[in-house]
Interface confidence: medium
């Protein structure tokens, strides 16, 4: 069971300082942006991180949403990352959900975060380069200290 607590507005960056945004095709991508670019591209660069209490505490349970033309929430259904047109729900009556991730700080690096899927244990949000695009994907942690699954989260409230 997950029960919604509060929400924060955040900018999410990978460890190369690229900013996560949602493109016109609703794809989550990373791109080099100055602070000014980041502001100019709002609301596509500002994410609503909603925190949930977890009946089985396993880290901070969160959803990641964006408010563009509609509210869309990040999902890892079938291990494929996409934004689904839906609100972060008030309650989820299950111990796993495609939209719930466990946000945890990287041991020894309090400012670096990882997001583990609640549906797929051991799978994390990651940044992966595909041709010219830097994409947000779901990836199994295969090595300790994998930088691709580490992010910084800057509160904008």
């Amino acid at each position: 069971y997950f029960g919604k607590l509060e929400s924060k507005l955040s900018v999410i960056r990978n460890l190369n300082d690229q900013v996560l945004f949602i493109d016109q095709g609703n794809r989550p991508l990373f791109e080099d942006m100055t602070d000014s670019d980041c502001r100019d591209n709002a609301p596509r660069t500002i994410f609503i991180i909603s925190m949930y209490k977890d009946s089985q505490p396993r880290g901070m349970a969160v959803t990641i949403s964006v408010k563009c033309e509609k509210i869309s929430t990040l999902s890892c259904e079938n291990k494929i990352i996409s934004f689904k047109e839906m609100n972060p729900p008030d309650n989820i009556k299950d111990t796993k959900s495609d939209i719930i991730f466990f946000q945890r700080s990287v041991p020894g690096h309090d400012n670096k975060m990882q997001f583990e899927s609640s549906s797929y244990e051991g799978y994390f949000l990651a940044c992966e380069k595909e041709r010219d695009l830097f994409k947000l994907i779901l990836k199994k942690e295969d090595e300790l200290g994998d930088r691709s699954i580490m992010f910084t989260v800057q509160n904008e409230d």
Partner: antibody, heavy 125, light 107 residues
């Protein structure tokens, strides 16, 4: 049809705490889908959002007032309340309570669709 | 905070006129904008939300348009009851902020 009725003292002394209550009829503050908000308007000036409370108890405050504001809900009485501490003459305004449709996929979100009639609160010794 | 700037501050018009009020946001807010009408001594009343969606019960002479940073409220044919002050409000992210208001008065 939801209606909001405001109550509370209209005169508050400087440095004291302003307290107002909004009673909701025709709907429940404990059902999801809405925030319950406070907005103020100094005489002859524009509107300023103070803060909102969700049925779950989550609160959202204007950063410019956050250190002085508390919004709370009383589900059995179907009321929500505003407390603003350490008031000065600059806090003299008409205070409104309002209902706010929450984040919603169909986009009815984060505006103020039902308002109380407003209470003029004067801060003066 | 997102700053909302309305123009003009005051607008003089006559019954039957078509009038337009503009609102500019300090950053892109997509379509997350609402318009309100306020008469003296009364609470504001929402007219339009999501930039162009007419609130239930609001006359069709009111319309809204725009996206990003620039928005307009249009009254196609002014009626005597439309003389009031109009406010825009961004509904993208808190803190929710309002424009300073446009007073629509009789010419």
């Amino acid at each position: 049809q939801v209606q909001l009725q405001q109550s509370g003292p209209r005169l508050v002394k400087p440095s004291q705490t302003l307290s107002l209550t909004c009673t909701v009829s025709g709907g429940s503050i404990s059902s999801g889908g809405y925030y319950w908000s406070w907005i103020r308007q100094p005489a002859g000036k524009g509107l300023e959002w103070i803060g909102s409370i969700y049925y779950s108890g989550s609160t959202y405050y204007n950063p410019s007032l956050k250190s002085r504001v508390t919004i709370s809900g009383d589900t059995p009485k179907n009321q929500f309340s505003l407390k603003l501490s350490s008031v000065t003459a600059a806090d003299t305004a008409v205070y409104y309570c309002a209902r706010t449709p929450a984040y919603d996929g169909d986009a009815r979100a984060d505006f103020f669709d039902v308002w109380g009639r407003g209470t003029l609160v004067t801060v003066s010794s | 905070d997102i700053v909302m700037t309305q123009s003009p501050s005051t607008l003089s018009a006559s019954v039957g006129d078509r009038v337009t009020i503009t609102c500019r946001a300090s950053q892109g807010i997509s379509s997350w904008l609402a318009w309100y009408q306020q008469k003296p001594g009364r609470a504001p009343k929402v007219l339009i939300y999501k930039a162009s969606t007419l609130e239930s019960g609001v006359p069709s002479r009111f319309s809204g348009s725009g996206s990003g940073t620039d928005f307009t409220l249009t009254i196609s044919s002014l009626q005597p009851e439309d003389f009031a002050t109009y406010y825009c409000q961004q509904s993208l992210y808190p803190p929710w902020t309002f424009g300073q208001g446009t007073k629509l008065e009789i010419k």
